[in-house]
């Protein structure tokens, strides 16, 4: 009889442990859901406020046609500049036409004057070809003037109304570019 009671007691204790475990899992699951919900709500509110503002470009970015441009206020080497742009959901500036080049140089004149700004152009070490960061070649009128005699990697930058080249490890301002949001109205 005592053995029977002892067995029942052990079974009850086992059941209690399982229930505690289930409760712990549920609490953990609930906490995880709450965190996800918080993230979703914040993300939705962010998206809604962006949509409400319905500006094609973020604050402090300049718009021209389908593009938004950000002119940095800090110096960095070319690779860090690329990294900074990616963090903003953009890439270093890729100049597709003379019209775009004129817009950029005109805007820079108004904002900061004659400084150096990295763009998304680099020279292939083996072939010596200039390539934009998406792998495309610049149009013939948008090739940097040969100015760098560097043995290191060479990258492109804008100064005044010219495209020039320099050792990628030198410090310059930089320009990021992203697509402007299309209005669905």
């Amino acid at each position: 009889k005592l053995l029977q009671v002892s067995t029942i007691a052990m079974q009850q204790q086992e059941k209690l442990i399982q229930q505690e475990r289930a409760l712990l899992n549920f609490t953990e699951w609930k906490r995880s859901c709450a965190l996800q919900m918080k993230y979703c709500q914040a993300f939705m509110q962010n998206s809604l406020s962006s949509a409400h503002n319905s500006s094609p470009c973020p604050n402090n970015w300049i718009q021209n046609r389908e593009s938004c441009y950000y002119v940095s206020e800090i110096w960095s080497i070319w690779h860090t500049s690329q990294e900074n742009c990616l963090k903003e959901g953009s890439t270093l500036l890729q100049i597709e036409s003379k019209e775009e080049m004129d817009f950029i140089t005109g805007s820079l004149r108004k904002i900061k004057g004659s400084y150096d700004y990295w763009v998304g152009l680099s020279q292939d070490g083996h072939s010596g070809r200039w390539l934009w960061q998406d792998g495309s070649s610049p149009s013939p009128g948008l090739l940097p003037a040969e100015r760098s005699q560097s043995a290191n990697q060479v990258c492109g930058y804008v100064k005044s109304n010219s495209l020039l080249s320099s050792n990628c490890s030198t410090w310059k301002y930089f320009i990021c570019e992203k697509y402007a949001l299309r209005s669905s109205v």
């Epitope: 990616l86 963090k87 959901g89 953009s90 960061q133 697509y179």
Partner: nanobody
């Protein structure tokens, strides 16, 4: 916490191809950019390729014309197609996600565990 699950690494002969995949546990659009970085022994981690949520692409200079980055939004997955592989492409390849800030709070990058790519005959 975001999980980035990489796959597709391995041993391949020079001139061969590999395709890496990186599946994220969260929607692609909650990131400003996703991409691949690599680190060879004794070297710094370098950008291989990245794609922004707007679809802009950036490649590392040494892989241009050989590697192609793409994404599948429905699967929250980013791919790296690596062709014409060279011994100097040997490295650990890491998937990376740059989170879009929520309410101005900045979060550091998310990284995968890394997948080894060895190019050797």
């Amino acid at each position: 916490q975001v999980q980035l699950q990489e796959s597709g690494g391995g041993l391949v002969q020079p001139g061969g191809s590999l395709r890496l995949s990186c599946a994220a546990s969260r929607s692609f659009f909650s990131f400003n950019a996703m991409g691949w970085y690599r680190q060879a022994p004794g070297k710094q981690r370098e950008l291989v390729a990245a794609i922004t949520n707007g679809g802009r692409i950036a490649y590392g200079t040494s892989v241009m014309g050989r590697f192609t980055i793409s994404r599948d939004n429905a699967k929250n997955t980013v791919y790296l197609q690596m062709d014409s592989l060279k011994p100097e492409d040997t490295a650990v390849y890491y998937c990376n996600a740059k989170p879009a800030p929520v309410y101005g709070s900045t979060v550091g990058d998310y990284w995968g565990q890394g997948t080894q790519v060895t190019v050797s005959s």
